[in-house]
Interface confidence: low
C-alpha cells in the first residue's frame, strides 16, 4: 500500500548542487520517512548526520539537499525508509563523484537468481595502478596495472541472493571518494518466478516492469502504471498512479527514480544515461531508453509513451484491434463515512476498460493492512468489491483508500471512517407486573453507554432453560407490555439500543430475571429449512417436550442431492435450531430430523432447499412472445432451479428510442414464468430485454428480443422469439 | 433383509484374473454405492474400490489402479471386481460392501469370499 | 492420503471395565469417522457413525465422540460379546481409510 519513490538527482556529484528526495506518494505514514546513509552497503562512508527537511513541494516527502561547497562528504550509499505496520520499506541509493576514475554502466542492476551476470565499470581516468573492486566494502578483486581494460567487469555466474550488494571500483591508491558504485539486486527467484517456493509464475510486467518475488505483482518503472505496466502516463508524472509530476523545465531530466526492490533505479520514461539527462534515440522508449518501438501500421513512437496506437488498436506495438482502454475511476466513494463498531462491509465501485476484476481491487486500512473483496460483482459499466471486517473499532477510524489496479492504469481514492461506539444500556429493566402469559416492563433504557443519538430501543426477551434465540420487541416508550408468555416459565429480559447506520445495535444491556404464573403446555411442532448464506441453511423447529422423563435429542440428517455428502448431526432435545454449515455454494440439500431417546424416533418428511448462490443467474430460458395484440403481447420463459433467483426483470422499450426510455417491469415473485404487456402502441416494433437477478446481482442478456404489435383491427400473433443481436 | 453375498473367490496363480460377483438383495441396489473392502490374512481392512451403480460413477486406491475393475449389473442387482495381473500381496478376503445412500459409512457387508494369489 | 492411527492396537480388559479407543487422523476430517467392531472370520459391523451416531441395534453402552482428527470410541461396560477387534474409517476424502484395528481381549 506504500508507494516510496527516492529521486536521486543527480547520482554522479561535480561541483552543482544535487539531493536525494524520498516520496511517499498517496500513502499517508503514521511513522515518518527516513533518508539516511547506507552503512550496511559501506560501512566505511562519511559520518556526518544528514540534514533532512520537509519538501514543501510535497505533503509526503523528506529531502536532503547537499550545496557545491559539500561535494567531499557525499560519497557513498543512502536509504530511504517508510514504515507501515511495523514493516519498513527501505529505498536504496548511491551517489558518487564525476571525477571517480571508473564509472558504472549502471546505477543498479536487477538480475534473476540463476542468471549470468556481467558488473561492469567503465575506466575513464587512465593511472599506472592497479583496480580494485569491493562488494558492501569488502575486497572482492584485483586486476594489475598493466591489464585494466576499458570495461573493468565482475563475471558471476548463476547469480544467487548472497551475490546482491554496492559492488565499488576504483585504483589502488584511490578511496571512496574516487570510488563507482553500482548495486546489484538478485531476485530470490528464477526468472518469472515468485512466491515462497518460487513456483508461482509472474505477470509479464511489460515496459520493464519488474515482478516481485515476494507478490508477483508489477514494481512499475517511473512513467508507467497498472498491473503490468503497460499504460503509460500522461507526460512528466511518475508513481504509482502517476499522480507525481516531474516540475523540472525538460520533466523529468536529471531525475534517477529508484523504488523498492527488486526494481533499483532507473531514468524516467523518455531518459537514459547515469545522470539521466540524455533523451532516448528516436526508435526507443522507456525507461533508461531501453525499448524499442515496434509500430504497426506506421503508429509514431513517443519516447515517453512508446507506440502512440490510432483509435480501436492496442498494446505496446499496436497489435491488438480492440476497444480501447480506460484508466480505472473510483466511482460512488463519499469522503466521509459514519460506521457502527462490529461488522463493516464497505464498497468499492470502480468503471474501467477492462472492468477491474476481483483481484484488482483492495482497500487499505489507516495502518496499512490490505484487505481483498469478500464479494465482488459487476455490471456493464462498473465493478462493485465489498470487503468484510469482522470487527471495526475506534481505532479503525481514519484514512482508508480504496485501490484499483487494472492493465489500464491505477487509482487510489482515500476517504475518512469515523468508527463510532455502539450503546448499551447501563440498568437492568425493572418488571412491573406479571401475569400467566404477560409481563409490564420499565426497559429503564437511559443512562446508556456509548454514543448516540439512538434511533430506536429493543426490548430482548427469552425462557431462561430453552436455548432457543432471543426474541424481541421494538419499543418508544419506556413502559411496554409483554404479551403471549409461556405460563410457569422463568424469562430473562434486557434492553438493545439502536444508534444510525447499519450494525447500529449496540450491546444488550445488563439482563432481569422473571417468572409467569403456570398454566398447562402447548404441544410442538414446525420444521422448516431456510438458506442463510451460500454456506448455510437454518433448520428450525418448535420446543419439544416430550411426555417422558427420559433424556432426548434431536438428530439431523442432511445430505447434498448432487454431491455424494452425507452429514449426521446431533443436536440438544433443548435446541429449537441447527445452523448446517460448511455447505457449498449453490447447491441443493435434502434434510430430515427426528427425536431420539434410547430408541430412535420416526424420521420426518424431507425438506429441501438450496443455499444462496455464489454466481450470477443464467439468462432465463425458452423466452416466448405470443398473444400479440394491437396494445398488449405475453412473454414467458423458464429459468433454472438452483440459482437463488429472486425476481425477473421485463425491460422494454420501442425500437429505436433512447436507452433510458425503457421500461422496466419488477416480477419479484420468481416462480411467475409469463407476463403480459400491456398498454403498448399499435404497429410498434419494441426491444425486449428479459433478465434474472439473484443475490449476486443480475444475469446478462446476449439477445434482445423484438416484439412487433399488431394494427388495431388484426388478430393476435404469435412470435417465436426472433432475436436481434446487440 | 439387506443381504451382501460375494461369489468367485479361489485360488489363482499370480499374473492370473478373477472376476468377484456381489449379488444384493433387500434394498434399491440404484440407490446404493457399493464397495470391496478386503483383509489380508491377519491384517486390517482396506478399500480396494466402490462403484455407483446408479451412474457407474467409479473410485479406485491407488494400490489396483489399472488392475481391477469395478462394474455393476442394475437388472441382476450384481456388482462385479474383475482382478487382472493378480500378484501376491492381493491375497485377502475381500468383503462386498454397501454405503447407503452416499459413500460414507459400510453399513451392510458380505460374509467376505478368499482370494489366494500363489504359484 | 489421510493416515487414521489408532490406539491402543491391543488391549486387556474384564467384564464391566469401561474401555476407551482412540483414533488419529493425519488431517481435519470433521465428523466424518466410523467405527466398526469386527469377530474373527466375519465380516466387519457397524457401530458408531459420524463420530457420534450409534448405528440401530447396537447396544447404548456403544459411544463415540470427537471432531477433526482426535476420534473416542468408548465402551461403558465391556460385555462378554464385546471382545473383538475395533477399526476407525474415515470418509472425508476418497480413498476412505482405515485405522490398523485395536484387539479387545479378555483378562
Known amino acids: 500500500a506504500m508507494d516510496l519513490i527516492l529521486i536521486n538527482s543527480l547520482p554522479l556529484v561535480s561541483d552543482a548542487e544535487t539531493s536525494l528526495t524520498c516520496i511517499a506518494s498517496g500513502w499517508r505514514p503514521h511513522e515518518p520517512i527516513t533518508i539516511g546513509r547506507d552503512f550496511e552497503a559501506l560501512m566505511n562512508q562519511h559520518q556526518d548526520p544528514l540534514e533532512v527537511t520537509q519538501d514543501v513541494t510535497r505533503e509526503w516527502a523528506k529531502k536532503v539537499v547537499w550545496k557545491r561547497e559539500k561535494a567531499s562528504k557525499i560519497n557513498g550509499a543512502y536509504f530511504c525508509e517508510g514504515r507501515v505496520r511495523g514493516e519498513a520499506i527501505r529505498i536504496r541509493t548511491m551517489k558518487m563523484r564525476q571525477q571517480a576514475s571508473f564509472l558504472p554502466a549502471t546505477l543498479t542492476m536487477t538480475v534473476d537468481k540463476g542468471d549470468n551476470v556481467n558488473i561492469s565499470f567503465k575506466k575513464v581516468l587512465i593511472k599506472e595502478e592497479d583496480a580494485v573492486i569491493y562488494k558492501n566494502g569488502s575486497f572482492i578483486h584485483s586486476v594489475p596495472r598493466h591489464e585494466v581494460p576499458d570495461i573493468l567487469e565482475v563475471h558471476l555466474p548463476h547469480a544467487q541472493p548472497q551475490d546482491a550488494g554496492v559492488y565499488s571500483a576504483r585504483y589502488i591508491g584511490g578511496n571512496l571518494f574516487t570510488s563507482a558504485f553500482t548495486r546489484l539486486i538478485v531476485r530470490r527467484c528464477e526468472a518469472q518466478k515468485w512466491g515462497p517456493e518460487c513456483n508461482h509464475l509472474c505477470t509479464a510486467c511489460m515496459n520493464n516492469g519488474v515482478c516481485h518475488e515476494d507478490t508477483g505483482e508489477c514494481i512499475c518503472p517511473p512513467g508507467f502504471m497498472g498491473r503490468t505496466c503497460e499504460k503509460a502516463c500522461e507526460l512528466h508524472t511518475f508513481g504509482r498512479t502517476c499522480k507525481e509530476r516531474c516540475s523540472g523545465q525538460e520533466g523529468c531530466k536529471s531525475y534517477v527514480f529508484c523504488l523498492p526492490d527488486p526494481y533499483g533505479c532507473s531514468c524516467a520514461t523518455g531518459w537514459k544515461g547515469l545522470q539521466c539527462n540524455e533523451a532516448c534515440h528516436p526508435g526507443f522508449y522507456g525507461p533508461d531508453c531501453k525499448l524499442r518501438c515496434s509500430c504497426n501500421n506506421g503508429e509514431m513512437c513517443d519516447r515517453f509513451q512508446g507506440c502512440l496506437c490510432s483509435p480501436g488498436w492496442q498494446g505496446l506495438q499496436c497489435e491488438r484491434e480492440g476497444i480501447q482502454r480506460m484508466t480505472p475511476k473510483i466511482v460512488d466513494l463519499p469522503d466521509h463515512i459514519e460506521v457502527n463498531s462490529g461488522k463493516f462491509n464497505p464498497i468499492c465501485k470502480a468503471s474501467g476498460w477492462p472492468l477491474p476484476t476481483n483481484e484488482e481491487m483492495t482497500l487499505v486500512k489507516p495502518d496499512g493492512t490490505v484487505l481483498h473483496p469478500k464479494d465482488f460483482n459487476h455490471t456493464d459499466h462498473f465493478s462493485v468489491a465489498i470487503f468484510t471486517i469482522h470487527r471495526i473499532l475506534p481505532p479503525d477510524s481514519g484514512v482508508w483508500v480504496c485501490s484499483v489496479n487494472t492493465v489500464a492504469g491505477m487509482v487510489e481514492k482515500p476517504f475518512n471512517i469515523s468508527v463510532k461506539v455502539l450503546p448499551k444500556p447501563l440498568n437492568a429493566p425493572n418488571v412491573i407486573d406479571t401475569g400467566h402469559n404477560f409481563a409490564v416492563i420499565n426497559i429503564s433504557s437511559e443512562p446508556y453507554f456509548g454514543d448516540g443519538p439512538i434511533k430506536s430501543k429493543k426490548l430482548l426477551y427469552k425462557p431462561v432453560n430453552h436455548y432457543e434465540a432471543w426474541q424481541h420487541i421494538q419499543v418508544t416508550n419506556e413502559i411496554v407490555t409483554l404479551n403471549y408468555l409461556e405460563p410457569r416459565t422463568e424469562y430473562e429480559l434486557c434492553v438493545q439500543l439502536v444508534r444510525r447506520g447499519e450494525g447500529g445495535e449496540g450491546h444488550p444491556g445488563p439482563v432481569r430475571r422473571f417468572t409467569t404464573a403456570s398454566i398447562g403446555l402447548p404441544p410442538p411442532r414446525g420444521l422448516n429449512l431456510l438458506p442463510k448464506s451460500q454456506t448455510t441453511l437454518n433448520l428450525t423447529w418448535q420446543p419439544i417436550f416430550p411426555s417422558s422423563e427420559d433424556d432426548f435429542y434431536v438428530e439431523v440428517e442432511r445430505r447434498s442431492v448432487q454431491k455424494s455428502d452425507q452429514q449426521n448431526i446431533k443436536v440438544p432435545g433443548n435446541l429449537t435450531s441447527v445452523l448446517l454449515n460448511n455447505l457449498h455454494p449453490r447447491e441443493q440439500y435434502v434434510v430430515r430430523a427426528r427425536v431420539n431417546t434410547k430408541a430412535q424416533g420416526e424420521w420426518s418428511e424431507d425438506l429441501t432447499a438450496w443455499t444462496l448462490s455464489d454466481i450470477l443467474p443464467p439468462q432465463p430460458e425458452n423466452i416466448k412472445i405470443s398473444n400479440i395484440t394491437h396494445s398488449s403481447a405475453v412473454i414467458s420463459w423458464t429459468i433454472l432451479d438452483g440459482y437463488s433467483i429472486s425476481s425477473i426483470t421485463i425491460r422494454y422499450k420501442v425500437q429505436g428510442k433512447n436507452e433510458d426510455q425503457h421500461v422496466d417491469v419488477k416480477i419479484k415473485n420468481a416462480t411467475i414464468t409469463q407476463y403480459q404487456l400491456k398498454g403498448l402502441e399499435p404497429e410498434t416494433a419494441y426491444q425486449v430485454d428479459i433478465f434474472a437477478e439473484n443475490n449476486i446481482g443480475s444475469s446478462n442478456p446476449a439477445f434482445s428480443h423484438e416484439l412487433v404489435t399488431l394494427p388495431e383491427s388484426q388478430a393476435p400473433a404469435d412470435l417465436g422469439g426472433g432475436k436481434m443481436l446487440l | 433383509e439387506v443381504q451382501l453375498v460375494e461369489s468367485g473367490g479361489g485360488l489363482v496363480q499370480p499374473g492370473g484374473s478373477l472376476r468377484l460377483s456381489c449379488a444384493a438383495s433387500?434394498?434399491?441396489?440404484?440407490?446404493?454405492?457399493i464397495s470391496w473392502v478386503r483383509q489380508a490374512p491377519g491384517k486390517g481392512l482396506e478399500w480396494v474400490a466402490r462403484?455407483?451403480?446408479?451412474?457407474?460413477?467409479?473410485y479406485y486406491a491407488d494400490s489396483v489402479k489399472g488392475r481391477f475393475t469395478i462394474s455393476a449389473d442394475t437388472s441382476k442387482n450384481t456388482a462385479y471386481l474383475q482382478m487382472n495381473s493378480l500378484r501376491a500381496e492381493d491375497t485377502a478376503v475381500y468383503y462386498c460392501?454397501?454405503?447407503?445412500?452416499?459413500?460414507?459409512?459400510?453399513?451392510?457387508w458380505g460374509q467376505g469370499t478368499l482370494v489366494t494369489v500363489s504359484s | 492420503d489421510i493416515q487414521m492411527t489408532q490406539s491402543p492396537s491391543s488391549l486387556s480388559a474384564s467384564v464391566g471395565d469401561r474401555v476407551t479407543i482412540t483414533c488419529r487422523a493425519s488431517?481435519?476430517?470433521?465428523?466424518?469417522v466410523a467405527w466398526y467392531q469386527q469377530k474373527p472370520g466375519k465380516a466387519p459391523k457397524l457401530l458408531i457413525y459420524?463420530?457420534?451416531f450409534l448405528y440401530s441395534g447396537v447396544p447404548s453402552r456403544f459411544s463415540g465422540s470427537g471432531s477433526g482428527t482426535d476420534f473416542t470410541l468408548t465402551i461403558s461396560s465391556l460385555q462378554p460379546e464385546d471382545f473383538a477387534t475395533y477399526y476407525c474409517?474415515?470418509?472425508?476424502?476418497?480413498?476412505?481409510?482405515f485405522g490398523q484395528g485395536t484387539k479387545v481381549e479378555i483378562k
Open positions: 460392501a454397501r454405503n447407503n445412500r452416499f459413500p460414507t459409512w459400510f453399513d451392510y
Open positions: 433387500g434394498f434399491t441396489f440404484s440407490g446404493s454405492w
Open positions: 462403484i455407483n451403480p446408479y451412474d457407474g460413477n467409479t
Open positions: 488431517q481435519d476430517v470433521s465428523t466424518a
Open positions: 459420524s463420530a457420534s
Open positions: 474409517q474415515q470418509s472425508y476424502t476418497t480413498p476412505p481409510t
